[in-house]
Amino acid sequence: AVNGTSQFTCFYNSRANISCVWSQDGALQDTSCQVHAWPDRRRWNQTCELLPVSQASWACNLILGAPDSQKLTTVDIVTLRVLCREGVRWRVMAIQDFKPFENLRLMAPISLQVVHVETHRCNISWEISQASHYFERHLEFEARTLSPGHTWEEAPLLTLKQKQEWICLETLTPDTQYEFQVRVKPLQGEFTTWSPWSQPLAFRTKPAALGKDT
């Protein structure tokens, strides 16, 4: 929802967290603001305190329940409001009717590990965290490998167009240090976006055997 120079953007992690960012030019830094969530079909409501992340933007996480509990469904709509204190009352600064499964951003994949490493290839696996039962197998992944002397931005993206929680990296250089990251995205949702990148996994390929062609 955008009001003039105000922007209010939220994402649902598909289980029990809605993360919101509110930005407004010229907003007072010392004003106390919060996000309030009212689902249309549920018995709970939730509030979180907006904390500054830059000069004109604030963020907070609505914790809806235990991390792996499914708190919203594909038919739910949540009214999200930014409320800021003005003297003794609260003023509504922004409002949106939020469809959780149209605005998904999952948690970064976790538990990255090297399953098998050779001189030229490496098999890596990972797990998804706090992902809804609704997705079944309807997820995709992007992966990238950091080579020596390059930046993450330069790393080519490898796309896995299915729920495949492993990858076999080929054509690697022997006895070389690499780093690997992966991110996940559900196929569902008009405004769904990629998860953050996972924590990097460092690994080293095996040295080439002496006397062998590399």
């Epitope: 018995r43 499914q70 469904t73």
Partner: antibody, heavy 116, light 107 residues
């Protein structure tokens, strides 16, 4: 206290339409979904559709193939369910209910009999 | 559509007995499972919401448990006024669907 009061029993001929009303009181009508459920004799409960009075948004069970229309009159805090092209198998008790993490309050039910 | 299957279809128990009714969903519905009581005259009441939440005014002898596809309604000590038909219902997705019901009688 929350109350949902439905209109009285109806007898209709095949091919006709029926419109059942559900008057809500004891809560803010525009803030909760109203759902319609029916129960044919000796059968399980069957969800027909729902409406959010605050916006007029509706959802329908595809089984009813466009025969059902759910509306509200917010000024009267009343929801309506209209079922058209009636057939004998539509003979059932029709219930309205409020949705709030389950259907937490129900109307008393309206018996609709379809008979030639 | 998600199919809901209850068992048993009917049961007879004595006052004071512990009674268990089960409900199985044809696919994972997380915890979006509710239980209703329908008295012989047709009156419907919500007993349990979101698998285990006790609706206001419902006696504490009623409880619910389960997750995913398998769910249970338990009456810890059966009372004469519990004679009714009990229905499970999923609100995981539209169209919402109900079990076929379990008719409970007193011996």
């Amino acid at each position: 206290q929350v109350q949902l009061v439905q209109s009285g029993a109806e007898v209709k001929k095949p091919g006709a339409s029926v419109k059942v009303s559900c008057k809500a009181s004891g809560y803010t009508f525009t803030s909760h979904w109203i759902t319609w459920v029916r129960q044919a004799p000796g059968q399980r409960l069957e969800w027909m559709g729902d409406i959010y009075p605050g916006s007029g948004n509706t959802n329908y069970n595809e089984k009813f193939q466009g025969r059902v229309t759910i509306t509200v009159d917010t000024s009267a805090s009343t929801a309506y369910m209209e079922l058209s092209s009636l057939r004998s198998e539509d003979t059932a008790v029709y219930y309205c209910a409020r949705e709030r993490g389950g259907f937490d309050y129900w109307g008393q039910g309206t018996l609709v009999t379809v008979s030639s | 559509d998600i199919q809901m299957t209850q068992s048993p279809s009917s049961l007879s128990a004595s006052v004071g007995d512990r009674v268990t009714i089960t409900c199985r969903a044809s696919q994972d519905i997380s915890n979006f499972l509710n239980w209703y009581q329908q008295k012989p005259e047709g009156t419907l009441k919500l007993l349990i919401y979101y698998t285990s939440g006790l609706h206001s005014g419902v006696p504490s002898r009623f409880s619910g448990s389960g997750s995913g596809t398998d769910f249970t309604l338990t009456i810890s000590s059966l009372q004469p006024e519990d004679v009714a038909t009990y229905y499970c219902q999923q609100d995981n997705n539209h169209p919402y669907t109900f079990g076929q019901g379990t008719k409970l009688e007193i011996k």
